[in-house]
């Protein structure tokens, strides 16, 4: 089933079929017995109830208000009311561009990396039973594709694939021919596979500790395969035998990046470990990100605002 119209602000192009579907439609048993009303308000008119007699272009079906087609004067606020449930939409109907196969203000932009999988599928689930045929245009030139019900492009992107792709669905309703256009502005870009690595969590962490005890400082990052994560400490006064970097743990994310975690273990905490910076750094060819940990004696906690503490 087609999902409901949850966006409160909607822009549509004049001359195309359009519908609003309220979001309490799943309460089917209530709908049968409950009074349901659709209203429109615009300018001077306040809450005019809509019904098929209001306009020959308007149709009401269960959960849906249909326009055959929507026109400029349909701009305004629409309300659906049922018992104590109300839903409101603000509809803005804009002029069709008569000199192009699409209207610039109704374009969905997509960025595709070169050599990555690129797909355009012309589908319209709500009107699919009424659609006679569908055509796909690139920069307003019709593409000759096999399937004229759901034309599809599936390929690895090349720079020449850049352009405006318009799916135009042709459908009949009450003896009239209508079309619905959906346009994508496809931009092909260089491979952007490398992310800027980033450490997770606050940049400065005060950790409350007790002398003689141990502490584990955990540093996590989202990074690329070739990036590194490490702890920086003791450069000035040499290494501390009580400080140990544990083995890095690394897990691949669904997006093909890496989640890394590296623990610094400080054993038998002494005065020399307090109030000094233990920095964790993630580094790539593009730059670094660093977060700092400061060990603070538990007794001194009161001197530091609560929001800077890490438990």
């Amino acid at each position: 089933a087609e999902s409901c119209t949850s966006r409160p602000h909607i822009t549509v192009v004049e001359g195309e079929p359009f519908y609003l579907k309220h979001c309490s439609c799943s309460l089917a048993h209530e709908i049968e017995t409950t009074t349901k009303s659709w209203y429109k308000s615009s300018g001077s008119q306040e809450h005019v109830e809509l019904n098929p007699r209001s306009s020959s272009r308007i149709a009401l079906h269960d959960c849906v208000l249909e326009f055959w087609p929507v026109e400029l004067n349909d701009t305004g606020s629409y309300f659906f009311q049922m018992k104590n449930y109300t839903q409101k939409w603000k509809l803005n109907v804009i002029r069709r561009n008569k000199h192009s196969c699409f209207t610039e203000r109704q374009v969905t932009s997509k960025i595709v990396e070169v050599k990555k999988f690129f797909q355009i599928t012309c589908e319209n689930s709500y009107y699919q039973t009424l659609v006679n045929s569908t055509s796909l245009y690139k920069n307003c030139k019709k593409l000759l594709l096999e399937n004229n019900k759901n034309p599809t492009i599936k390929k690895n992107a090349e720079f020449e694939d850049q352009g405006y792709y318009s799916c135009v669905h042709f459908l009949h309703h009450n003896g009239k021919l209508f079309n619905i256009t959906k346009t994508f502005n496809i931009t092909i870009v260089e491979d952007r596979s490398n992310i800027v690595p980033v450490l997770l969590g606050p940049k400065l962490n005060h950790v409350a500790v007790e002398l003689g005890k141990n502490v584990r400082l955990n540093c996590s990052a989202l990074l690329n395969e070739e990036d590194v994560i490490y702890w920086m400490f003791g450069e000035e006064n040499g290494s501390d035998p009580n400080i140990h970097e544990e083995k890095e743990m690394r897990i691949m994310t669904p997006e093909g990046k890496w989640h890394a975690s590296k623990v610094l273990r400080i054993e038998n905490i002494g005065e020399s470990n307090l109030n000094v910076l233990y920095n964790c750094t993630v580094a790539s060819t593009g730059g670094t990100d660093t977060k700092s940990f400061i060990l603070v004696r538990k007794a001194d906690m009161a001197d530091i605002p609560g929001h800077v503490f890490t438990r």
Epitope: D227, V228, Y230, M232, E235, E236, G238, S239, T281, A283, S284, T285, G286, G287, T288
Partner: nanobody, 118 residues
Amino acid sequence: EVQLVESGGGLVQPGGSLRLSCVASGSISSINGMGWYRQAPQAPGKQRELVARITSGGSTIYATSVKGRFTISRDNAKNTVYLQMDNLKPDDTAVYYCNIYGGALWPWGQGTQVTVSS
């Protein structure tokens, strides 16, 4: 773009020694930290562990697993960083790389393979 060329790796028996060298095509004198990283054969992805680092002032820090066995040094005049590896263990088997420590990395070199096996 600076290029890094590592060398000195090889097959060595447990307890043996190797001296790795890393030559940079650009100056390292202005680079505060340089480090030796290693990528173990079973590491996920290209996970590289920082095993030794040296600051421009000569301060050195070592990973717990190599402390007392590895020694890092640098020769700014030759744009070279060294790693002296003694008392090698099978766990030290890895591809070793040098790179910046404490700043944005240079592009990785090809590394040098160290295999410790009897």
